[in-house]
Amino acid sequence: LEETLLNTKLETADLKWVTFPQVDGQWEELSGLDEEQHSVRTYEVCDVQRAPGQAHWLRTGWVPRRGAVHVYATLRFTMLECLSLPRAGRSCKETFTVFYYESDADTATALTPAWMENPYIKVDTVAAEHLTRKRPGAEATGKVNVKTLRLGPLSKAGFYLAFQDQGACMALLSLHLFYKKCAQLTVNLTRFPETVPRELVVPVAGSCVVDAVPAPGPSPSLYCREDGQWAEQPVTGCSCAPGFEAAEGNTKCRACAQGTFKPLSGEGSCQPCPANSHSNTIGSAVCQCRVGYFRARTDPRGAPCTTPPSAPRSVVSRLNGSSLHLEWSAPLESGGREDLTYALRCRECRPGGSCAPCGGDLTFDPGPRDLVEPWVVVRGLRPDFTYTFEVTALNGVSSLATGPVPFEPVNVTTDREVPPAVSDIRVTRSSPSSLSLAWAVPRAPSGAVLDYEVKYHEKGAEGPSSVRFLKTSENRAELRGLKRGASYLVQVRARSEAGYGPFGQEHHSQTQLDESEGWREQLA
């Protein structure tokens, strides 16, 4: 980027620069015509017959340097070829010299500083690349010369530029004084300010553009070169904050549009809101969950919103004495999550009708909650109780939801308790064809024993047709019609209002071989 200090092409009034000495053949200000056919102010000198060593000087007005350390001067000039000038002497030149003089104010006069090298600082002797020439019988032809010179380093508030002619026929068509600066640059979302280089290269700290944050690592910097170009160098740079994405060639951060979001700073663009969420404002880092939908604390910010599952379905119970096997089907709606678990709540009602949460005597296998499989075995059920089990399905957002948790209930009533198995059977009498048996009355939990059932069969005769039954209301029985000297297996069970209890252990008895032993009482 170039910042102009002086451009004579843009001047409309007379330049009125200072010349020295005040003699004929001196630099003269004239109107000229530039490439765009605009009138410009020019200076011309054409004293090709002067005495050797005589110089014509032309000095610009005072030019403030505006912080520039090096200033560039682009000269556009034309010059006549000495060979085309028949009256030109040996002093005719095709060069001129450029000088500058620094000062802190516009203090120069017609005579000061002295018109010579030192105090003036020589910049360069400029030779024409293109000469305007005229050959007899032909039109004059020529081209404009363009030369850029570098002045400096400068340290004072301003300077004058001076031109010394020592015998050229030339016109200074325009003078452009400028300095180079690195233009404001935005790269990788980092803004580097406009910078005037003070040295060969100057480090420049960058700052993040609006809605961007520094990337990890060293703060971004670029080098501004003396020629006004930024040194090509990777920039760690910045990245757009959450809710913003890079736009316009990585030069600015644009807020995510409604319905989109960006959860993290860094690269990447705004994404549509995930399922069951929305963003009603621009610049969203996270999309809000719809009513009834949630994100678990462990869910990423960009995860879809989910809802608690519906209730499990089709609970099936299988009661086996004091044990209960429950199983069910998965809920129709999982809520959009994979972390489905089940839990059970339990209430028990006594035969009298008073109900309470289940006591600690129940055991659940694998447990009452955090079940991953759709079944459970409940043990320790008490007889003649009614149990209500509520099976709920849960997931990672169930704890965030308000309102009742849907459940599938199942009611199970246990049987009243039957008498225990009858054991301790005794043979009170034995004959070749009969056996008399007696046993202790079992302690029935639910009322008295109503009667007993005796089951017996000859040992070795295992088929169903060989088994015989005998009912008795007393805690004794006589088995008749038995074989002589045969072994029999006997079992007894008691019946109460709750029903039959289990048969007791098989008791081994044997009939007599002959009558002589007859009706002998035996103890089992």
Epitope: E28, T42, C46, L85, A171
Partner: antibody, heavy 126, light 109 residues
Framework: QVELVQSGAEVKKPGSSVKVSCKAS????????ISWVRQAPGQGLEWMGK????????DYAQKFQGRVTITADESTSTAYMELSSLRSEDTAVYYC???????????????????WGQGTLVTVSS | DIQMTQSPSSLSASVGDRVTITCRAS??????LNWYQQKPGKAPKLLIY???ILQSGVPSRFSGSGSGTDFTLTISSLQPEDFATYYC???????????FGQGTKVEIK
Amino acid sequence: QVELVQSGAEVKKPGSSVKVSCKASGGTFSTYAISWVRQAPGQGLEWMGKIIPIFGDADYAQKFQGRVTITADESTSTAYMELSSLRSEDTAVYYCARSSYTILTTYYNYNAMDNWGQGTLVTVSS
Amino acid sequence: DIQMTQSPSSLSASVGDRVTITCRASQNINNFLNWYQQKPGKAPKLLIYGSSILQSGVPSRFSGSGSGTDFTLTISSLQPEDFATYYCSQDHFYPPSGTFGQGTKVEIK
């Protein structure tokens, strides 16, 4: 502002020559083109030739080639036009005119003439 | 030689009229065309050069256009002091023989 002052009216015999002068006052002379233009009574303008004093040599219209000589004296900032072998049809007002820009200060080689002398009447009569 | 042809050779117009004069070159002269105004007994005055560039001090009612072979001088609103003869001239060819057109006389209607 430059001024071009021409020499006075002349009456010439056919076959003779006439030399008209044109003195420029104020500023640069050597690098401007000085053209000579004539105008016969009741007629249009006719370009005769031009000189850029610094170069010395002049350019002429084909019609006047060999009969006209244009010169310049840089020391006095004066241009001259001499026309020989005069004929009655050479009776005209003769103007000198300076180009708008010097040979050095225009990007285009414009010969547009923005400064004119007052004119010199040359009468050729026997 | 290159020929410069102006038309019309004369025209009558009233103050305030828009007047157009054309000039045609026999060969392409790019934009190297000038327009002059001459009043009786006076030296010509440069109005326009480079086909369309208004000479310093010339009123803006004068304008020029064209390139190549066809050129136009326009006076947008004729003023009393504009009654004169107008000449075109070419700057392009060397040597510039036949430089001037024959002139267009603008008279009061």
